[in-house]
C-alpha cells in the first residue's frame, strides 16, 4: 500500500489518510477500530496497547465528529480517579469542558462512549465491546 | 497532504487510505460522509454528484462492516424500479441477496440505510439526512 | 492562591428570591466541580448544589430541588445560585466549595467564607 | 440517601491525649469519605479525603482509617488549635451528605 514514487495525480481537494494500521477507519488523520468481542475495560486496554493504540480519547467534537453517528456503547479511555474526583483520559489528561456528557447509571470508574458525544460510567470489570484510537503524528 | 516524494518510513501493516475528499472518511479505500442537513433523495442524490462521488451503495458486507455500527437513518443509493419490481443501485446494478433487509416501512421507492444492514422504504420526497460515498480507483 | 469570595446574602421576605455570587481565582475554574453547601445557625453542614461544566452534570439536594438554580459563568471564572419561593428553613450561611477534581466524587478542597442568607418576614 | 452518624457528638479532652472520631455510613461507601474541621464563626477546612489520604499542608497527627461503612479519624496527640467541630462527608453518590459533628472542646 506503500504511496512513494507514485506518479498519480489527485485532485488538490482529495487527499490521502493515515497511516492506519490496515483495515482501520481514518478521519481528519486519526485512525479508529470498532472491535465486537466483549472485553473488560483493562482487557479491552490491553488490546488497543497491543495494537500500538489507545482506547478512544475524545478530544474534539469538530474532529471527531464521526463519533456522533455511532452506535450502541463501547469502551474508551476515560477513567475516574476516586482520590480527587476527577474524569481523566489514559494519557493522564483532564476531561475537557463541554466534550461528553457523563451520565451515572451505574457505579464505576470506567466509562462506556454513546452516540451524541455521551459517557455512561460503568464497572470496569463488565465485559463490552470497544474503540481503539491512533492518533497519527 | 501529498505524501509524494517523502521519505517517510511507515510499518507493513500500517497504510494510507484515500485519496478521498478532504476530510471524508476513508475505510477499506473506500471514502464515506454522513451529511446532516436533511434532504429529500432526488436533492441528495445531487449533493453526492456535485462532490464527484454517490449516494451510499451497500455491495460487502465485510468491506462496509463499519455500517454496522451506523445511528439513525439517512438515504443511501438504493431505488425501486416499479416496472419489474426490483431494487436497484443508482449506477444500475441490483442489490445483491443477503446484503440488506428490506423493511416496509412506509410506500416508496426510495430506502433509508439503518443500522446492521437495514434498508428501510421511503417516500422519495421526504428530507433525511443522507450518506455519499466515493469508490478509491 | 485559590480564593472564593461569596456575595449576594441578605435579608429576604419568604417567598422572596435571593441571586448568591461566588467569584473564583487562582485556578482553570471550567475544570473543576463546583457545590454551595450551607449551614443553618448553630447546625451542621448541608449540600445543597452541584455543576460540574466539564462533565456536564448538575444535581441539587431534594429540600431544594425546583427552587433553587446552580449556575457558572466560566468567562467570569464565577458560579451562582438563583433562590426562588424561600422558606425560613432556608435560613443559613452559605459557602461556595470548589471539589478537588470534575466531578462530585472530589472533596470539598477549598471553601470561600460565607454569605449569610435570612429569610424572615 | 446515604446517613453518616458520627459518635461521639461532644468530646472532652486535653492537650497531648488521642482522640479518636467514628463516622458510620448507612451503606457502603467505599473509600469515598472526607473529613472537615471547622472553627467558630470559620468555613471548613479540608483535613482527610479518600478515607485515609492526608491533605497538603495538614499535621500528620491526623489520621484517617476504615472503609466501607466504618470510618475514623484519629488526632494523635491533641494541641490546643485542635479543639473545633470535625465533620465526616460522604461523595460516593449524591445527595453529598455530612455527618452531624463531633464538637471537640477542651476539658
Known amino acids: 500500500n506503500s504511496l512513494f514514487n507514485q506518479e498519480v495525480q489527485i485532485p488538490l481537494t482529495e487527499s490521502y489518510c493515515g497511516p492506519c494500521p490496515k483495515n482501520w477507519i481514518c478521519y481528519k488523520n486519526n485512525c479508529y477500530q470498532f472491535f465486537n468481542e466483549s472485553k473488560n475495560w483493562y482487557e479491552s486496554q490491553a488490546s488497543c496497547m497491543s495494537q500500538n493504540a489507545s482506547l478512544l480519547k475524545v478530544y474534539s467534537k469538530e474532529d471527531q465528529d464521526l463519533l456522533k453517528l455511532v452506535k450502541s456503547y463501547h469502551w474508551m479511555g476515560l477513567v475516574h480517579i476516586p482520590t480527587n474526583g476527577s474524569w481523566q483520559w489514559e494519557d493522564g489528561s483532564i476531561l475537557s469542558p463541554n466534550l461528553l456528557t457523563i451520565i451515572e447509571m451505574q457505579k464505576g470508574d470506567c466509562a462506556l462512549y454513546a452516540s451524541s458525544f455521551k459517557g455512561y460510567i460503568e464497572n470496569c470489570s463488565i465485559p463490552n465491546t470497544y474503540i481503539c484510537m491512533q492518533r497519527t503524528v | 497532504n501529498s505524501l509524494f516524494n517523502q521519505e517517510v518510513q511507515i510499518p507493513l501493516t500500517e497504510s494510507y487510505c484515500g485519496p478521498c475528499p478532504k476530510n471524508w472518511i476513508c475505510y477499506k479505500n473506500n471514502c464515506y460522509q454522513f451529511f446532516n442537513e436533511s434532504k429529500n433523495w432526488y436533492e441528495s442524490q445531487a449533493s453526492c454528484m456535485s462532490q464527484n462521488a454517490s449516494l451510499l451503495k451497500v455491495y460487502s458486507k465485510e468491506d462496509q462492516d463499519l455500517l454496522k455500527l451506523v445511528k439513525s437513518y439517512h438515504w443511501m443509493g438504493l431505488v425501486h424500479i416499479p416496472t419489474n419490481g426490483s431494487w436497484q443501485w443508482e449506477d444500475g446494478s441490483i442489490l445483491s441477496p443477503n446484503l440488506l433487509t428490506i423493511i416496509e416501512m412506509q410506500k416508496g421507492d426510495c430506502a433509508l440505510y439503518a443500522s446492521s444492514f437495514k434498508g428501510y422504504i421511503e417516500n422519495c420526497s421526504i428530507p433525511n439526512t443522507y450518506i455519499c460515498m466515493q469508490r478509491t480507483v | 492562591e485559590v480564593q472564593l469570595l461569596e456575595s449576594g446574602g441578605g435579608l429576604v421576605q419568604p417567598g422572596g428570591s435571593l441571586r448568591l455570587s461566588c467569584a473564583t481565582s487562582?485556578?482553570?475554574?471550567?475544570?473543576?466541580?463546583m457545590s454551595w453547601v450551607r449551614q443553618a445557625p448553630g447546625k451542621g453542614l448541608e449540600w445543597v448544589s452541584y455543576n460540574s461544566f466539564s462533565v456536564g452534570s448538575t444535581d441539587y439536594a431534594d429540600s431544594v430541588k425546583g427552587r433553587f438554580t446552580i449556575s457558572r459563568d466560566n468567562s467570569k471564572n464565577t458560579l451562582y445560585l438563583q433562590m426562588n419561593s424561600l422558606r425560613a428553613e432556608d435560613t443559613a450561611v452559605y459557602y461556595c466549595s470548589k471539589h478537588s477534581g470534575n466531578y462530585y466524587t472530589g472533596p470539598f478542597h477549598y471553601w470561600g467564607q460565607g454569605t449569610l442568607v435570612t429569610v424572615s418576614s | 440517601d446515604i446517613q453518616l452518624t458520627q459518635s461521639p457528638s461532644f468530646l472532652s479532652a486535653s492537650v497531648g491525649d488521642r482522640v479518636t472520631i467514628t463516622c458510620r455510613a448507612s451503606q457502603g461507601i467505599s473509600s469515598y469519605l472526607a473529613w472537615y474541621q471547622q472553627k467558630p464563626g470559620k468555613a471548613p477546612k479540608l483535613l482527610i479525603y479518600a478515607a485515609s489520604s492526608l491533605e497538603s499542608g495538614v499535621p500528620s497527627r491526623f489520621s484517617g482509617s476504615g472503609s466501607g461503612t466504618d470510618f475514623t479519624l484519629t488526632i494523635s496527640s491533641l494541641q490546643p488549635e485542635d479543639f473545633a467541630t470535625y465533620y465526616c462527608?460522604?461523595?460516593?453518590?449524591?445527595?453529598?451528605?455530612f455527618g452531624q459533628g463531633t464538637r471537640l472542646e477542651i476539658k
Open positions: 487562582g485556578f482553570t475554574f471550567s475544570d473543576y466541580a
Open positions: 462527608q460522604q461523595s460516593y453518590s449524591t445527595p453529598i451528605t
